[in-house]
Interface confidence: low
């Protein structure tokens, strides 16, 4: 028998520095977790103690904090090289800055293979990107070899900016021939490493013949055997065992997100490459694990540029950006309109001639808007200004909801109107009219939404049974501010870009902004 230790991360999302327990900015070091310096300490400890170790990443290193905003992927290559990752799969967020934003900072700089079997380049890009990412890689580990085959969510064109010269194929269809090829090369230990979410990970384990282990990402799935060490609730045991169509027990793993845990899986193979046993658990990277001093010093050196960036002008406003709670928790506010417009703009994807865009709607809890921005400071808007408006380090995510769920959400928005509560919704691509003289739960008297399957966008009444795409803060997608109906009834949820980054990019693009209050939210006569 031969034993392999797989160490794995996924959905790190730019958390290079240690973070708080909820993966936001670290303040109290005694409570902080994760970060590449701490990760390196634990990885080195395991490398010294165990003979056959692979360190793998299942995608979405890109996007999530000011580190990515400033360094645009160079920080990913630098620190992943420093940690000596063995392989990485491409995630959807790796395409957030277009293909160029992937090629230059990461693909050309990484000293480890970057993988995806279901992304095929065409046209002029095919020669430019050739060899920079691979469908699979055979890695020598001790006296043996292990094949790693990569995959990426086929939804990436809707979630990011891969352009028109990359085709995202069905994962299972694309993986099978690559695994078969590895078998012909006498590689009998094969890991599928990818970024399509836990449901697809399980399907790959079930359907792709020859895959021994699946290491996944995208769905931020936390698996754990026994009592979990922090606040994450396990979606199942670690590893999650799937019985394949040909009768094999295939371990599937994922390690939550944000570098909070290091996945730790021990696999025992027989001489024919069959999995005899698998066990392990994610390791919580808490403050009991010291940060490696050399990596920490490097982090501090790279940080200097971040501090400077915070005070640089992104663009100008020529109007007061009203982000006060007195406005945003009671009525349409122009800060809410600005943020929603930025959220939609960030999700422009012309993927189908029938649709002007795949999504037209935005909702945003007024309580998430924490500060106004005064135009009388020469109109200057900085990252620091935006950090005061959006201080929680969230993301703006894409969900699919039925019209009936949206209706419930808008009823919840005003169910206790007038108490300055955070659930009052700001909107984009939506016209809502409330009648506050009616009973809570029956106050939405008109709800019109902007069409997507149209060449000239216009507002149509919401249909209860229709499925709509909506951009919203991850806080709402997770049921925050009492929006339990969103969490319970959403049909799909894909995590998006860092909230401040979305707004800062929009402001930089527009250069000068002047959002207005324009009648997106109205109150029927006599009630307000």
């Amino acid at each position: 028998a031969w034993e392999l230790t797989i160490l794995h991360t996924n959905d790190v999302h730019s958390r290079l520095e240690q973070t708080s327990e909820d993966s936001s900015k670290c303040v109290n070091a005694s409570r902080c977790m994760g970060g590449v310096a701490r990760l390196f300490t634990k990885v080195q400890q395991i490398r010294r103690a165990e003979p056959n170790v692979l360190l793998l990443d299942a995608g979405d290193q890109y996007q999530g904090t000011i580190w990515f905003t400033v360094y645009k992927g160079a920080e990913v290559a630098h620190f992943m090289n420093a940690l000596r990752y063995d392989a990485m799969a491409l995630g959807n967020h790796e395409f957030d800055n277009g293909v160029e934003g992937l090629i230059e900072p990461l693909l050309k700089e990484a000293k480890f293979p970057i993988l995806s079997a279901n992304i095929k380049a065409k046209g002029p890009l095919a020669s430019q990107i050739s060899g920079l990412y691979l469908p699979y890689k055979v890695l020598p580990v001790g006296d043996e070899v292990v094949g790693i085959v990569g995959y990426t969510s086929k939804e990436t064109p809707f979630l990011s900016n891969p352009g028109t010269n990359l085709v995202f194929e069905d994962e299972i269809t694309a993986l099978q021939p690559e695994v078969d090829k590895l078998k012909t090369l006498n590689v009998n230990k094969i890991i599928a490493l990818g970024h399509s979410g836990f449901e697809m990970d399980k399907l790959i384990a079930q359907k792709v013949r020859g895959v021994d282990v699946v290491v996944g990402g995208h769905s931020n799935t936390f698996l754990y055997t026994g009592n979990p060490p922090s606040k994450e609730v396990p979606a199942g045991k670690y590893p999650f065992i799937v019985t394949s169509d040909d009768g094999r027990k295939v371990p599937v793993v994922q390690a939550y997100a944000f570098g909070k845990y290091l996945g730790y899986l021990k696999i025992e193979f027989d001489e024919r490459g069959n999995v005899i046993s698998s066990h392990g658990n994610p390791i919580l990277l808490n403050s009991s694990i010291p940060e490696d001093p050399s990596i920490k010093a490097d982090i501090n050196k790279w940080r200097i540029k971040l501090d400077n960036y915070s005070t640089q002008e992104l663009g100008k406003t020529i109007v007061y950006l009203d982000g006060s709670s007195q406005s945003c928790r009671f009525r349409e506010c122009n800060m809410g309109n600005l943020i929603c417009d930025a959220m939609i703009n960030n999700n422009l994807r012309h993927t189908d001639e029938m649709f002007w865009n795949h999504v037209s709607m935005c909702i945003l809890n007024g309580g998430g808007i924490r500060s106004p921005i005064d135009e009388r400071n020469n109109g200057t808007i900085t990252w620091e200004n935006l950090a005061a408006v959006l201080p929680f380090g969230g993301t703006f995510d894409l969900v699919q909801l039925k019209g009936s769920t949206l209706k419930k959400a808008f009823e919840h928005s005003v169910h206790r109107y007038g108490q300055s509560t955070g659930e009052f919704l700001q909107v984009g691509g939506i016209h809502v009219v409330y009648d506050l003289s009616r009973k809570p739960g029956d106050r939405v008297v008109k709800l019109d939404v902007l069409c997507t399957k149209c060449r000239v966008p216009s507002y149509d009444p919401l249909k209860m049974d229709e499925v709509y795409k909506v951009i919203l803060p991850n806080f709402l997608a997770n049921g925050g501010d009492g929006f339990q109906m969103i969490k319970d009834e959403l049909l799909r949820h894909d995590s998006g870009d860092q909230d401040i980054n979305v707004v800062s990019t929009y402001i930089s693009k527009m250069k000068v902004i002047y959002p207005a209050v324009e009648g997106r939210i109205k109150f029927s006569t006599g009630s307000h």
Epitope: S20, E21, N28, P229, S230, E384, F392
Partner: antibody, heavy 122, light 111 residues
């Protein structure tokens, strides 16, 4: 609405232990830190320690570390603070408080229990 | 640990006047644009009540005559147009590092 209801006043002898309870309602108990603060008669506030009920993680003020134990029962949404080896200077009102904010990096105490008077007297 | 020093110890004002309460930390409690300083009001026989969090944010339900400011080590709680119901003890508290500590308090009296 958020409420923290503490157990009633206690009179203990020096050297004994006391266990004060704090029952939480109106919010997700496992998602917010519970802090214990004490106030001796006519004095200021003193941070004793806290617990994250979701994971059982605790932090203690070094001053009390050997004598205080903070626990939480998720099934009843109740936090407990036990102080052992009591002495007369431990006579104080003991408060539990919820750490608030949409982000755990806030740590301000947004809701407080009514306080429990513990008198240590022989 | 970080020591918080409040001044003055007692402040005696007439209704309508402005109260300025100071809290000085022995070490920085601000970082990256955030100030981990909070203010509480406590009336006799009652539990403290949060007024201001993160130096300048007014807690929900607190009258707007209360405001907070400061960055680094020096922080101020201001009460404009003070009213008789504002007579109380006021405490500052930091949450920059463990252990969190409180100031010794300022007593505000209304003449």
């Amino acid at each position: 609405q958020v409420q923290l209801v503490q157990s009633g006043a206690e009179v203990e002898k020096p050297g004994a232990s006391v266990k004060v309870s704090c029952k939480a309602s109106g919010y997700t108990f496992t998602s917010y830190w519970i802090t214990w603060v004490r106030q001796a008669p006519g004095q200021g506030l003193e941070w004793m320690g806290d617990i994250y009920p979701g994971s059982g993680n605790t932090n203690y003020n070094e001053k009390f570390k050997t004598r205080v134990t903070i626990t939480a029962d998720k099934s009843t949404s109740t936090a407990y603070m036990e102080l052992s080896s009591l002495r007369s200077e431990d006579t104080a009102v003991y408060y539990c408080a919820k750490e608030g904010g949409l982000t755990t990096e806030d740590y301000a105490l947004d809701y407080w229990g009514q306080g429990t008077l513990v008198t240590v007297s022989s | 640990e970080i020591v918080l020093t409040q001044s003055p110890a007692t402040l005696s004002l007439s209704p309508g006047e402005r109260a300025t309460l100071s809290c000085r930390a022995s070490k920085q409690v601000s970082t990256s644009g955030y100030s981990y300083m909070h203010w509480y009001q406590q009336k006799p026989g009652q539990a403290p009540r949060l007024l201001i969090y993160l130096a300048s944010n007014l807690e929900s339900g607190i009258p707007p005559r209360f405001s907070g400011s400061g960055y680094g080590t020096d922080f101020t709680l201001t009460i404009n147009n003070i009213e008789s119901e504002d007579a109380a003890y006021y405490f500052c508290q930091h949450s920059r590092e463990l252990p969190f500590t409180f100031g010794q308090g300022t007593k505000v009296e209304i003449k």
